[in-house]
């Protein structure tokens, strides 16, 4: 869009935002936000929701790919009126229930939820969020928290993943855009390369899988590498190693030549699986090459 | 293959009490949300109740509250729904089915409960 | 909370596309399942999420959900269709689901 960083993870993305009374003087900063963030998502394979939440929950925009409805969805964004109690959990809620949805598909897409709120939550709403973001963690989702203004860090650090999944933003909704650079550096998780792109039919190879955001799992030791052969069979791998811009994991044995081989990486031991356009093909290698 | 099968069900007075049970097979039981939804002769279906996958949540329409109670004991893969109070307009086919997020993807053949004097 | 009205009954010819409607204020932000009903059976869920197909559902089974209206359409329609649909919705935890108040198919 403008030159800045990018993300170009195939995964769904949910935005769950508070429009609750206390944010009605910065919902122009949240939508800002919000915009300018889900124009980095760049990759064709990523989907998009936007929630809001105040005294329920509202999916204002159902998870879609389709850029033209994004637009329409930041459209509607645009025109919030904030307004009542902050219930955060019926924002996991309305996730959660795509997720479920979505799962019962059978193929499970990664799933990535950038929550926002201002202002500290009450015993019981706090407990309900918490509760709730456990439940989208349980159907395979990662959970981002961002904090403004009045926020508690400890009560987000539990309904994120963990402290490193919250972003504070402690001088207030201007200040939102600042963070807008570290929020996609550590939210994005994508597969850029794999190295070599090309193996030889039936014989073992290990391969390198380039990209960023490997290291974000809540536990590294669930990171599989997945290949789905011929758009069909998929084969699961555990890598040999996890760093934060590439895996090291063994090839899957392609007999014939031709073959085709979609990557895959999954962040939580194969629940759900982050997609992408890089492709390992087969080739018919002379003895000696 | 995965299946719902209820009982319990009969003829009660009104302020009367039943408890039906559904027995699951077929999938991992722990893993599912469970509800109860009604439906009373010649009439629409209507929910009743949801618990949660572990039990610890439940839910329940404003119509029952109060009289009815949803358990379930995942060790015997069963689901219950303990109706205090009956009432003539409790007088349904009760369908007990797996759920998730208001989805019911598989449902019981149902059970008939009749409140009469 | 939300309420959902469906049409007491729908006609349609053998073959012939029918298209069973389901309404709500601002229905398009929720989502839609619709199950069929057969005479002295349980219901079958048939779309979940709008428009979704559960495994063993035939294709011509199909739905949508736009601006405050749900649609169950079901094209080349066979006789073994003829049954009360039910559209619903969920509320949330704190209201449950709630479910529309039936259509009954008739093929004629």
């Known amino acids: 869009e403008d030159g800045g960083p990018a993300c170009y993870g195939g995964f769904d993305l949910y935005f769950i935002l508070d429009k609750s009374g206390s944010v009605l003087h910065h919902w122009n900063e949240i939508y800002y936000f919000v915009e300018q963030l889900a124009h980095r998502f760049i990759s064709p394979q990523l989907r998009m929701s936007f929630i809001v939440f105040s005294t329920r929950g509202t999916t204002l925009m159902k998870l879609t790919e389709d850029r033209e409805q994004i637009r329409q969805g930041l459209e509607e964004l645009q025109k919030v009126l904030p307004g009542g109690d902050t219930y955060m959990h019926e924002g996991f809620e309305r996730a959660s229930e795509q997720i479920y949805y979505e799962n019962s598909q059978g193929y499970r897409t990664a799933s990535v939820i950038i929550a926002l709120t201002d202002g500290e939550l009450h015993e019981d709403l706090f407990f309900y969020s918490e509760r709730e973001a456990n439940r989208s963690r349980d159907l395979g989702a990662i959970v981002y928290c961002v904090g403004v203004k009045d926020f508690n860090e400890t009560q987000l650090a539990r309904i994120a993943d963990s402290k490193d999944h919250v972003f504070p933003v402690n001088d207030g909704f201007q200040a939102l855009q600042g963070i807008i650079h570290s929020i996609l550096k550590k939210s994005c998780i994508e597969i850029l390369a794999a190295e070599p792109s090309t193996i030889c039919a039936g014989e073992s190879f290990q391969v390198v899988v380039r990209g960023n955001g490997f290291r974000h799992a809540r536990n590294v030791d669930r990171v599989l590498c997945s290949f789905k052969i011929n758009d069909s069979v998929t084969l699961n791998e555990k890598p040999f190693a996890v760093e934060d811009t590439y895996l090291l994991c063994p090839a899957p044995i392609l007999k014939e030549v031709g073959m085709k081989a979609a990557l895959q990486v999954s962040m939580n031991d194969g629940l759900s699986f982050i997609s992408s356009s890089v492709i390992i093909t087969t080739t018919h290698c002379s003895d000696g090459s | 293959q995965v299946q719902l099968v209820e009982s319990g069900g009969g003829l009660v007075q009104p302020g009367g009490s039943l408890r039906l049970s559904c027995a699951a097979s077929?999938?991992?039981?722990?893993?599912?949300?469970l509800s109860w939804v009604r439906q009373a002769p010649g009439k629409g279906l209507e929910w009743v109740s949801n618990i949660s996958s572990n039990g610890s949540y439940t839910y329940y329409a404003d119509s029952v509250k109060g009289r009815f109670t949803i358990s379930r004991d995942n060790s015997k893969n069963t689901l219950y729904l303990q109706m205090n109070s009956l009432r003539a307009e409790d007088t349904a086919v009760y369908y007990c089915?797996?759920?998730?997020?208001?989805?019911?993807?598989?449902w019981g053949q149902g059970t008939l409960v009749t409140v009469s004097s | 909370d939300i309420e959902l009205t469906q049409p007491p009954s729908v006609s349609v010819a053998p073959g012939q596309t029918a298209r069973i409607s389901c309404s709500g204020d601002?229905?398009?932000?929720?989502?839609v399942h619709w199950y069929q009903q057969k005479p002295g059976q349980a219901p079958v869920l048939v779309i979940y999420g709008d428009n979704k197909r559960p495994s063993g559902i035939p294709e011509r089974f199909s739905g949508s959900n736009s601006g405050n209206t749900a649609t169950l359409t079901i094209s080349g329609t066979q006789a073994e269709d003829e049954a009360d649909y039910y559209c619903s919705s969920w509320a949330g935890s704190r209201s449950g689901t709630v479910f529309g108040g039936g259509t009954k198919l008739t093929v004629l």
């Open positions: 601002k229905l398009r932000e929720y989502y």
């Open positions: 089915a797996r759920a998730g997020y208001g989805l019911f993807d598989v």
């Open positions: 077929g999938f991992t039981f722990n893993s599912y949300g």
